[in-house]
């Protein structure tokens, strides 16, 4: 008995279906087939869960998360023993290994080894103003997304003709600010920041309102 | 009270342009972008642009940029949309909408009544 | 650039329950917030929901917001349904520069 070679790693948005290829072959029927898939989840290495079993012609659920998620993607018995796993979660993320018996082909490698990554698109950021908003001021703009795999990048730019900032701005790409020093009327207006990651962009608006100091009646 | 209170309705030849007027009352003018929406008979709703009363900078959805004009006259706490170059499938209700940035995203908490466009030769 | 879609229409008889969907057509629904409008007949929308789930404090409790990500929408649902709750009902989100602010293309809810 012979486990093929996988891809190596999956990689799924979250919310959608993966499939994790397993095949083999052997010189025996498939009237003993044994497979068990198991996951070592990235959060909890040390608490390997089994996801799905076939075992004497009969499927059996493995740990409850994956209840209802999880089955095979052809008609068993085959040599074709992926699974798919509909909704996925992010804590599906983990190495996933299917073990094959399949009596009397004994010997060979009889286990297969892919890992999945769940990536999750940037969630809808939050835009805030830190530091006073008078005349000559220095001002940050922050940015966060709560949620993103990989990490979102962050990019702010002014709503005008330009799409350009200040030119007293100075932006963080990775942490989300942009520090707007002196500001003066010119830096009033609506900002946007856009939060990307691989599988998706977000977006958030925010509106700075430069404060100019009343004049003092005599 | 706190209300937007928008022109009559204006009946319009293709070709022509139409400008509707949007008074605020009860609150700040100057405190929020104001916000035009259309919506054309038995359709839906359909954003235009918004307008920053303080600044007087403007931002227009694509579809009608060139074409649409959005001012304000803060004295007398008053926004215009102006819709040039008009055509038969103009015909719409424009709402102004006044615009909320909570926490970053655009919500309307307060319609005008709406005004009735109607393009017709 | 995305689109809302919405129902055409649903009905339900007084004091059931009614959902209204509204699914983003690509990009994850978490990623821009989305408010709810009712739509009376012949009057201007109102708002019901802002930022996916949050109520201002005159809407009643009877409507609330949720997203969905495996589905990839965002519902609105209705219960203890009344006569007076017959309207459109609009979903809306933003789009970034390119598209601005996005309304879905209404649901017709009747009471029965």
């Known amino acids: 008995l012979e486990v093929s070679e996988s891809p190596g790693s999956v990689q799924v948005a979250r919310g959608q279906t993966a499939v994790l290829p397993c095949a083999f072959s052997t010189s025996a029927a498939l009237l003993n087939l044994n497979v068990i898939w198991m996951v070592i989840p990235l959060s909890n290495a040390n608490q390997p869960e089994q996801v799905i079993l076939y075992q004497g012609g009969q499927m059996f659920d493995g740990a409850l998360r994956f209840h209802g998620r999880v089955g095979f993607t052809g008609t068993m018995p085959a040599t074709n023993v992926s699974i798919f796993i509909n909704n996925t979660q992010l804590s599906d993320t983990g190495t996933y290994q299917c073990l094959v018996n399949n009596l009397p082909d004994r010997g060979g490698r009889n286990i297969g080894v892919t890992g999945l990554t769940v990536l999750v698109p940037p969630s809808a950021p939050q835009c805030q103003i830190q530091g006073s908003q008078d005349l000559g001021s220095d001002v940050i703009l922050l940015c966060s997304s709560e949620e993103g795999i990989p990490r979102p990048t962050y990019l702010w730019e002014k709503l005008d003709n330009t799409l350009k900032l200040p030119p007293t701005a100075t932006q963080d790409q990775v942490q989300g600010t942009v520090t707007i020093r002196n500001i003066s009327a010119l830096s009033s207006g609506l900002y946007q920041c856009v939060a990307s990651n691989a599988i998706g962009t977000s977006t958030c608006l925010l509106d700075l309102q430069v404060i100019s100091p009343q004049p003092r009646s005599v | 009270q706190v209300q937007l209170v928008q022109s009559g309705a204006e009946v319009k030849k293709p070709g022509a342009s139409v400008k509707v007027s949007c008074k605020a009352s009860?609150?700040?003018?100057?405190?929020?972008?104001m916000h035009w929406v259309r919506q054309a008979p038995g359709q839906g709703l359909e954003w235009m642009g918004w307008?920053?009363?303080?600044?007087?900078?403007?931002g227009y959805a694509q579809k009608f940029q060139g074409r649409v004009t959005m001012t304000r006259n803060t004295s007398i706490s008053t926004a215009y949309m102006e819709l040039s170059s008009l055509r038969s499938e103009d015909t719409a209700v424009y709402y102004c909408?006044?615009?909320?940035?909570?926490?970053?995203?655009?919500?309307?908490?307060?319609w005008g009544r709406g005004t009735l466009v109607t393009v017709s030769s | 650039n995305f689109m809302l879609t919405q129902p055409h229409s649903v009905s339900e008889s007084p004091g059931r329950t009614v959902t209204i969907s509204c699914t983003r057509s690509?990009?994850?629904?978490?990623?821009?917030?989305v408010q709810w409008y009712q739509q009376r007949p012949g009057s201007a929308p109102t708002i019901l929901i802002y930022?996916?789930?949050?109520?201002p404090s005159e809407v009643p409790d009877r409507f609330s917001g949720s997203i969905d990500i495996s589905s990839n929408s965002a519902s609105l649902t209705i219960s203890g349904l009344k006569t007076e709750d017959e309207a459109d009902y609009y979903c809306?989100?933003?789009?970034?520069?390119?598209?601005?602010?996005?309304f879905g293309g209404g649901t017709k809810v009747t009471v029965l």
């Open positions: 809306q989100s933003y789009g970034g520069t390119s598209q601005g602010v996005l």
């Open positions: 930022e996916d789930k949050e109520r």
């Open positions: 307008i920053n009363p303080n600044s007087g900078n403007t």
């Open positions: 909408a006044r615009g909320r940035l909570e926490r970053g995203y655009w919500y309307f908490d307060l």
């Open positions: 690509s990009g994850s629904i978490t990623s821009n917030y």
């Open positions: 009860g609150y700040t003018f100057t405190g929020y972008y």
